[in-house]
Interface confidence: low
């Protein structure tokens, strides 16, 4: 028998009997993928003296197309499978008559989740086995008897990673408007440790809770024009794959080290989150790497600290916020949380107190927009494969899918006058609804800057006058000189920079003589090598936690725990004048260039990292020989 969970009980709750409204009487053949749970459903709940009508729609984008589940089979072998028939019972929506409301519930066995009206966050869960029409408890989070949970990310580490904090940075935007940029997507991989598995008792119970949690996290992030899509779930039903310590910082380092080793054979994801049943030391319930999203350190650990899954969902949303560059609200002068004070704090408050937060503060949004300006954030721009989203295209999910011209979310959330939110078609007279080259529902003229140059290895992009999206981000031609190195796919890799990335600010490239060692497995032997393109050798700084090192003389190389693989000098790193590391060897810069590409750009553009002409403002690809206006005139009006 799985040990019972030391969850606290509710102090005050109201008993309600939800009433399901009859669905539309439409007789048609339903596609087989719709399964047992309807696409849309509405419930009436009588609570706190009101009748709340919840309109819900299935979260068709909860699971990515290649979603996998990994667990240990009875014979002890690890199994990864893509479950078929991914019907589920996780819904999102709003409360009728309340413009800024939100709801996130599961209907699998009764109703469980939250709905938010104004500043009040109501939690609902079944009291018995009576299903959706049975007795349910509706209560507010402050009536859940629990201790306050805190985030383990220290203000010191935040300060050093986020820079100076001043009130001036945070100009509040109207509370109801989404950021006007394109939707971003976090492809999430969730790991559930053995302690959590033991407490929940079965793979099915774990799966259910995780999907519930991710559904809530996704709903919280939708207000920031983000979607959180689960691409993989790993359940440690037999034993933990690394030591899950009560010290959350140790557990995080162990998670990230383990993830680095697994990455080649597991999902390529943007972010990994551990959900643990281990009770972290003190009041800490979560710990994360700050500004690490899209890097090898993109992850966090979360203690499942509350009976209601909204608790760990808020923790995960908070820790993911740190991954996205957000600071604790208390650390920022002038930070505004629109949340009514007695209803609690915003998501990035350092401790959750007695109530679950439901929104991000102005400063969290400003930190996020700042993070998205970094080249590092590029992994969030790619949507999961929209042709394969589980459940097919659905209007109102913020994904522009087959048959749609735009998608600004459900009608109650849509604030985009260029898009008809009920049909996902452009409004009358609109040329576009989304994109940085779309302004006031019209495509911006050719030559307008849409993506400025970020650094010396970047190129600026201009609107082409035909498409609402800014052209794909392009970079200086590989081999262009940059600070101490040569540009390579938009980066400027140098030995010093690599050492600092792993060993911290004090990290430096080791002496040149160190690079003459090629370390063999086990750190036992080495042989002579003629260049600096083998193992990355550093000195100074602090040894990354959870990483083993191999020391030869004064040279430090990072290795996996078993000593079989070493951190290599990355491709494109400068290894001498006019020389770069390429395929593990120090080679002349001309390995990047097969021909004199720039000569083909007619002096109206330069060559980019793909060896294609990147045209100056107003000139047309592929060879920048004609003005965009001439090309457009010849080919007719907008598509």
């Amino acid at each position: 028998i799985a040990p019972s969970r030391p969850w606290a009980l509710m102090e005050q709750y109201e008993v309600v009997l939800p009433w399901r409204l009859p669905g539309p009487r439409v007789r048609r053949a339903l596609p087989s993928h719709l399964g047992l749970h309807p696409e849309r459903v509405s419930y009436v709940l009588g609570a706190t003296g009101h009748n709340f009508t919840l309109h819900l729609r299935k979260n068709r984008d909860l699971l990515g197309s290649g979603y996998t589940e990994t667990y240990t089979a009875a014979n002890g072998s690890e199994v990864t499978e893509q479950p078929r028939g991914q019907d589920h019972c996780f819904y999102q929506g709003h409360v009728e008559g309340y413009p800024d409301s939100a709801a996130s519930l599961s209907t699998c066995a009764g109703l469980r989740g939250f709905f938010q009206v104004g500043s009040d966050l109501h939690l609902i869960e079944p009291l018995d086995e009576g299903g959706e029409g049975g007795r349910h408890a509706v209560y507010q989070a402050e009536h859940l008897l629990q201790t306050a949970g805190t985030c383990g990310v220290s203000d010191d580490s935040l300060g050093s990673l986020l820079g100076p904090r001043t009130a001036a940075v945070f100009r509040p935007r109207p509370g109801d408007s989404l950021p006007s940029r394109e939707t971003r997507y976090v492809e999430l991989y969730v790991v559930v440790d053995n302690a959590e598995f033991q407490m929940l008792g079965s793979e099915a119970a774990v799966r259910h809770r995780v999907l519930e949690v991710v559904n809530h996290v996704d709903k919280l992030y939708q207000k920031l024009n983000f979607r959180v899509v689960l691409v993989g779930l790993e359940i440690w039903n037999s034993q933990d794959r690394f030591h899950v310590s009560p010290d959350p910082s140790v557990t995080l380092e162990n998670l990230l080290t383990w993830q680095a080793r697994q990455r080649t054979r597991r999902h390529l994801h943007d972010n990994v989150q551990l959900i643990t049943g281990v009770d972290f030391t003190g009041t800490t319930v979560g710990f994360a790497r700050v500004s690490a999203m899209c890097s090898h350190s993109s992850g966090a650990v979360n203690q499942d600290h509350s009976k209601n899954p909204v608790g760990v969902a808020c923790t995960m949303a908070h820790e993911m916020g740190h991954n996205l560059g957000m600071d604790h609200d208390e650390n920022v002068q002038g930070c505004r949380c629109q949340e009514r004070f007695e209803a609690g704090r915003c998501i990035m408050a350092g401790s959750i107190g007695s109530s679950f937060p439901r929104m991000f503060s102005d400063c969290s949004q400003a930190y996020l927009e700042s993070f998205l300006e970094r080249p590092q954030s590029v992994c969030l721009a790619n949507a999961p494969d929209l042709s394969h989203l589980v459940g097919g295209p659905v209007c109102g999910n913020l994904f522009v899918e087959r048959g749609e011209q735009c998608d600004c979310g459900p009608p109650e959330d849509c604030r985009n006058r260029c898009c008809n939110s009920t049909t996902c078609q452009l409004a009358e007279g609109a040329q576009c609804a989304h994109g940085t080259c779309c302004q006031e529902c019209k495509v911006k003229p050719a030559g307008e800057l849409c993506r400025p140059k970020k650094d010396m290895c970047d190129l600026e992009e201009f609107c082409d006058g035909r498409h609402p999206e800014c052209p794909e981000d392009a970079f200086q031609e590989n081999g262009t000189p940059c600070s101490g190195g040569y540009c390579y796919n938009g980066a400027c890799p140098t030995l010093a920079q690599q050492c600092q990335a792993f060993w911290g600010p004090g990290g430096q490239a080791a002496e040149e003589s160190c690079f003459s060692y090629d370390i063999l497995p086990g750190c036992k032997a080495s042989r002579y090598r003629a260049d600096m393109c083998g193992v990355l050798q550093c000195k100074g700084g602090q040894q990354p936690l959870g990483r083993a090192i191999c020391i030869v003389d004064v040279c430090h190389a990072l290795t996996t725990e078993d000593g079989t693989a070493y951190e290599p000098v990355p491709e494109g790193t400068r290894c001498g004048p006019e020389k770069v590391c390429w395929k593990g060897r120090c080679q002349d810069l001309h390995v990047y260039r097969s021909s004199n590409c720039s000569a083909q750009c007619h002096n109206h553009g330069v060559c980019n990292h793909k060896q294609e002409c990147h045209c100056h403002a107003g000139w047309a690809p592929p060879h920048c020989a004609k003005l965009l206006t001439e090309v457009h005139a010849a080919s007719g009006s907008l598509p």
């Epitope: 940059c482 101490g484 140098t494 010093a496 600092q500």
Partner: nanobody
Amino acid sequence: EVQLVESGGGLVQAGASLKLSCAASGRTYDIRVMGWFRRAPGKDRESVATVTWRDNITYYVDSVKGRFTITRDNAKNTVYLQMNNLKPEDTAVYYCAAQTEDSAQYIYWGQGTQVTVSS
């Protein structure tokens, strides 16, 4: 070449505060890390605090953690060291230094500014 000029040193009582400034000029776009170092009489030079120019990651020697804060203003090409709760053992010549993208060493140094803390 990068030129560094420190200012802000002086004589203070124990427990007082001082703010040092280091203004960089020249090829400042090449700077990757800037730091404050100090040399006390009869001792080796030690790193006090460093900051990465682009992403503002800071590092402090244990003896100054919680008392000293390094900040940078990219627009002014200036790095500051705010020193609070000064102790007599903080007495030293404080140097500003810069490390560039293509070097693993601090290759540019200022002339130094004297900080004296009396008990």
